[in-house]
Interface confidence: low
C-alpha cells in the first residue's frame, strides 16, 4: 500500500483546502526534474533558471557560464547544443511542432572562441533536424527531406542526398508511421562513434495511401493536410539504409546496407541502428508480421568500400506466443569486445530478462531471472552493468536501478536505489556520464520527485540536484487524496490496481467510482509515481473514488499477461476492467448506481467498449480521441497486435472489435464522445464513424469536437476539455456545482 503521508490534524483542518480544478489547469502543483546534459565523464551542462548555459565540473566543484542568456535572447533561442570539441554551440529558435517528436527550427551557430555568430554559409531555414558529430564539430542536418554535411560550421555544405521530396521521399528523418510507431524519434540518421561514418534511413512513401483532413485556420477556405499514413493492411513505406564516409563523402558516395535475406523475402521494417565501432554497425529488422526480428551486425570492407553483413552475424529473435519484443523490440548494448552484447528478451518462462549474446541467440547466457522483468539497460562498462527492473518487493509498478558486477565471477547484483528514500522513492530512472563515472538518479515518486547526483564507483550520493522544495511547501495546506496500490487475484490472473481515495475517506460510506483506463498492449497505468492531476482533484474536491487497473495486455508482468490480447484486441482489456469494477463493488464503499469510466486514445476505445458491454455496471462514460475500428489505425502498431485485416488472416476480429458494431448497447448509458478535428494520429474519422453509427441506431449521446486540435488537445482546449468533462461527471453523479 502506498499511502501519502497525511498532514491532516484536527487543529489544522480549517487551514487545509481541497484541490481545485483551477490548480490543475494552471499547473500549480507541477514538479521539476534535473537531467544533466553530460559532456564528459565528470562535466555536465545545465540551463539555469535565468537561462544561462552553465558548465559544471563535479570533480573540481567549479562551474562557469559558457553561454549567456543575452546571447540566447539575441536569437530567441529555446534550445542549444555544444559541439564535442567545445568550439561551437548551435542555438535553436522558431520551434514549430510537426508530429509527436518532429519539429522544424531555425539554427544559428555561435563560435565560443571569438564570441560571435558564424557568418557565411549560414544554415538554411527551417531545418528538420540538426546534430553535431560525436567528435569535433562536423554538422549533419536535414533540409527539405535531404541530408547535408558540413566539415566545419562555416564551410559550404556537402549535399548527401538529392531525391528528398515532401511526403514522398524522406532522408535522415522518419515519415509519420516510422516516427510514431517504430523509431519514436524525429531523426533517422546516426553518426559512428568517432564521426567517420554517417548512417541514414531513406523512407519511400510514394505508394502509401494519404490521410487528408481539413485544417480550418481563419482563412476563407480551409487548408487540407495530407499525410502518407498506412492504415492496417495498406501499402507500407519502403526503407533503405545507407552509410557515407564523412571524411571523403564524394569518393564513393552513400553505400546501401544489405537487408537480411530472410527479412527481405516479404514486407519488412527497419527498427533501429546501433553503432558498435567506426567500422561495425548493428541493424535491426522486423518482418511486417511482427513476430520475427533479425539483428544484423555489419562490417566495413575497406577493399570494396562497402558494408558486409555476414549470415553468421545475423541473430534471430522470434515469438511463438505473440509479437517480438515488448512495445518495441529491445536494442542491444554492446560490450567492450565490440561483438558480444546484452539484450532484453523473453526467457523460457516468458519473462523479459537480460541475456548476454556472444555467438548465437540459442547460446545466450541469461543474466537476470525471476517472475519479474528487466526493463532497461542503462550502461555497460568494463566491470558493471546498470539496469532497471520491477523486482523489488514484487510490485510491478516500481522501478529500481541495479548494478551487476560483470568484471568479477560469479557476477554479483546490488540494488542501488531500493533503500535510498524508500517511502518517497520507488520509481527511478537514471542518466550516466561517460564510462559511468557519475550518474544522476531521477525519482518520480510516489512522494515528491527528487533528482540526485551519485558517484559511479561507490554509488554515494554527492548532491541533490532538484528536490522540489517549493512544491513541498505549496502542498502543505492541501488536502491531497490518499493512494493505495494493491492487487486482485481473479481466475489465475493478477489485476494490479491503484485507488485514489478522498482525503476524509470512510469505508462505511458510499462513494461514486470513476475508472480511468488506458489498457493498450504493453502499457502500464498502475505505477508508483507522484501526480497532482485531474483525478487528484476529483478525489480531493468532488469526493470521488478513482481506480486504475492493469489488465491483460499490460506490461512488465510476463508474457502470459502481455500476449493474452494477441490478435484479439478489445476483448480481455474490457473484461478485466469490468471484473475489477465488480470486485470494487464487493469492497462495500462504492455506490453501484454511480460508476463511470473514461479514457483517452486506446483508453477511449476500451471505455467505449466497456460502456457498450451490456453489463449495466456503468451509468456514464467519456471517450477522448478513441480508436473505433482497428482498420482505421496505423499499420505498424495495429498489425503488431492484430495481424492483417484480410480474410485469410484476422479480418473477422477486425470487424468484430469495432465500437460501431455495439452502437445499440449505448442506449442505456450517458456517453460523451470527444475528438480533435486535426488529429494526425487517431483520425477524427474514428469518432465520426461512432457518431454516425449512434445516429443510425437512434441512440442519444453527447459530443464535443475541438477544431484544429491534434491528439493531445493542448493549450486552451485542455482547459475547456477538463471543465467540460468535470461538468459531465458531476451531472452523472448528481454532484452539485
Amino acid at each position: 500500500i502506498v499511502l501519502r503521508p497525511s498532514r491532516v490534524h484536527n487543529s489544522e483542518e480549517n487551514t487545509m483546502r481541497a484541490l481545485t480544478l483551477k490548480d490543475i489547469l494552471n499547473g500549480t502543483f507541477s514538479y521539476k526534474t534535473f537531467f544533466p546534459n553530460w559532456i564528459s565523464g565528470q562535466e555536465y551542462l545545465h540551463q539555469s533558471a535565468d537561462n544561462n548555459i552553465v558548465l559544471y565540473n563535479i570533480e573540481t566543484g567549479q562551474s562557469y557560464t559558457i553561454l549567456s542568456n543575452r546571447t540566447m535572447k539575441s536569437v530567441n533561442a529555446s534550445n542549444y547544443g555544444l559541439s564535442p570539441d567545445r568550439q561551437f554551440v548551435y542555438l535553436e529558435s522558431d520551434y514549430s511542432k510537426l508530429w509527436r517528436y518532429s519539429y522544424t527550427a531555425t539554427y544559428y551557430i555561435y563560435d565560443l572562441s571569438n564570441g560571435e555568430f558564424v557568418r557565411g554559409n549560414e544554415l538554411p531555414r527551417p531545418i528538420q533536424y540538426l546534430c553535431w558529430s560525436p567528435v569535433g564539430s562536423k554538422l549533419a542536418y536535414v533540409y527539405q527531406n535531404n541530408i547535408y554535411l558540413k566539415q566545419r560550421p562555416g564551410d559550404p555544405p556537402f549535399q548527401i542526398t538529392f531525391n528528398g521530396r515532401e511526403n514522398k521521399i524522406f532522408n535522415g528523418i522518419p515519415d509519420w508511421v516510422y516516427e510514431e510507431e517504430m523509431l519514436a524519434t524525429k531523426y533517422a540518421l546516426w553518426w559512428s562513434p568517432n564521426g567517420k561514418f554517417l548512417a541514414y534511413a531513406e523512407f519511400n512513401d510514394t505508394d502509401i495511401p494519404v490521410i487528408a483532413y481539413s485544417y480550418y485556420g481563419d482563412e476563407q477556405y480551409p487548408r487540407t493536410i495530407n499525410i502518407p499514413y498506412p492504415k492496417a493492411g495498406a501499402k507500407n513505406p519502403v526503407v533503405r539504409i545507407f552509410i557515407i564516409d564523412t571524411t571523403y563523402p564524394a569518393y564513393v558516395g552513400p553505400q546501401e546496407v544489405p537487408v537480411p535475406a530472410m527479412i527481405a523475402s516479404s514486407d519488412y521494417y527497419f527498427s533501429w541502428l546501433t553503432w558498435v565501432t567506426d567500422e561495425r554497425v548493428c541493424l535491426q529488422w522486423l518482418k511486417r508480421v511482427q513476430n520475427v526480428s533479425v539483428l544484423s551486425i555489419c562490417d566495413f570492407r575497406e577493399d570494396w568500400q562497402t558494408w558486409d553483413c555476414p549470415k553468421t552475424q545475423e541473430h534471430i529473435e522470434e515469438s511463438r506466443t505473440g509479437w517480438a519484443g515488448g512495445f518495441f523490440v529491445s536494442t542491444p548494448v554492446f560490450s567492450y569486445d565490440a561483438i558480444s552484447y546484452y539484450k532484453i528478451f523473453s526467457d523460457k518462462d516468458g519473462y523479459k530478462h537480460i541475456h548476454y549474446i556472444k555467438d548465437t541467440v540459442e547460446n545466450a547466457i541469461q543474466i537476470t531471472s525471476g517472475k519479474w522483468e528487466a526493463i532497461n539497460i542503462f550502461r555497460v562498462t568494463q566491470d558493471s552493468l546498470f539496469y532497471s527492473s520491477n523486482e523489488f518487493e514484487e510490485y510491478p509498478g516500481r522501478r529500481n536501478i541495479y548494478r551487476i558486477s560483470i568484471g568479477s565471477y560469479p557476477p554479483s547484483k546490488k540494488c542501488v536505489t531500493c533503500h535510498l528514500r524508500k517511502e518517497r522513492c520507488q520509481y527511478y530512472t537514471a542518466s550516466f556520464s561517460d564510462y559511468a563515472k557519475y550518474y544522476a538518479l531521477v525519482c518520480y515518486g510516489p512522494g515528491i520527485p527528487i533528482s540526485t547526483l551519485h558517484d559511479g564507483r561507490t554509488d554515494q550520493e554527492i548532491k541533490i540536484l532538484e528536490e522540489n522544495k517549493e512544491l513541498e511547501n505549496a502542498l502543505k495546506n492541501i488536502q491531497l487524496p490518499k493512494e493505495e496500490i494493491k492487487k486482485l487475484e481473479v481466475d489465475e490472473i493478477t489485476l494490479w490496481y491503484k485507488m485514489i481515495l478522498p482525503p476524509q475517506f470512510d469505508r462505511s460510506k458510499k462513494y461514486p467510482l470513476l475508472i480511468q483506463v488506458y489498457g493498450g498492449p504493453c502499457s502500464q497505468s498502475v505505477r508508483s509515481v507522484f501526480a497532482v492531476n485531474w483525478i487528484s482533484y476529483l478525489a480531493s474536491k468532488e469526493g470521488m473514488v478513482i481506480a486504475l487497473v492493469d489488465g491483460r495486455g499490460t506490461a512488465f508482468q510476463g508474457d502470459k499477461l502481455l500476449y493474452a490480447v494477441y490478435r484479439k484486441l478489445g476483448v480481455y482489456e474490457v473484461e478485466d476492467q469490468i471484473t475489477a469494477v465488480r470486485k470494487f463493488i464487493e469492497m462495500g464503499f462504492i455506490d453501484e448506481k454511480r460508476i463511470a469510466i473514461w479514457g483517452w486514445s486506446y483508453g477511449g476505445y476500451v471505455s467505449s467498449l466497456a460502456l457498450a458491454s451490456g453489463t449495466g455496471l456503468f451509468k456514464c462514460g467519456i471517450a477522448v480521441a478513441p480508436v473505433s475500428s482497428w482498420e482505421y489505425y496505423a499499420s505498424v502498431y495495429t498489425e503488431r497486435f492484430m495481424g492483417l485485416p484480410t480474410k485469410d488472416d484476422n479480418l473477422e476480429h477486425y470487424k468484430n472489435s469495432t465500437v460501431m458494431a455495439r452502437a445499440e448497447y449505448f442506449r442505456n448509458v450517458d456517453y460523451l464522445l470527444i475528438h480533435g478535428t486535426a488529429d494526425d494520429n487517431v483520425h477524427f474519422q474514428n469518432s465520426a464513424q461512432i457518431a454516425k453509427a449512434l445516429v443510425n441506431a437512434q441512440v442519444d449521446f453527447q459530443a464535443m469536437w475541438y477544431s484544429d486540435q491534434n491528439h493531445g488537445l493542448s493549450g486552451l482546449s485542455t482547459n475547456h476539455l477538463y471543465t467540460h468533462m468535470t461538468h459531465f461527471l458531476k451531472q452523472c453523479f448528481s454532484l452539485s456545482d
Partner: nanobody, 123 residues
Framework: QVQLQESGGGLVEAEGSLRLSCAAS????????LAWFRQAPGKSRELVAA???????YYADSVKGRFTISRDNARNTVYLQTNSLKPEDTAVYYC?????????????????WGQGTQVTVSS
Amino acid sequence: QVQLQESGGGLVEAEGSLRLSCAASGRTFGTYALAWFRQAPGKSRELVAAISSGGSTYYADSVKGRFTISRDNARNTVYLQTNSLKPEDTAVYYCAAKTGSAYYTNRIDWPYWGQGTQVTVSS
C-alpha cells in the same frame, strides 16, 4: 557505371541444364549486387536470383533448389546455373546490377541491365 552482356542461352529439353553467364565491364564490379531477371512473353519481368557484393544469395520460390547464382569477381562475371528446367522457365533472361543491397525484387531498383539471352525449354 557498369555494362553487362549475357550469354549461354539456347534451346534445351525439359529436365535439362544451362549455364548462363553475364560479363561486366567496370573496375568496381565487386561492389555491385547482381541479379538475374526473366521475362516470359506477355508477362512482367521477375527476379529469379540475386547475389550481394558479399556473396549472400536470394532466390525466387519457383527456382529454389534448381537454380544457383554465383559470381567470380576476378573474372567480372556472374553465373546462373539452371538445372531441372521446365517449360515454364522459357523466357528472356536478363542480367542486372545495382549498388547496395541485392534484396530488391522490383526492376526499378536495378539501374544497370544487359540485352538479355533467350532460354527455351521444350517439353
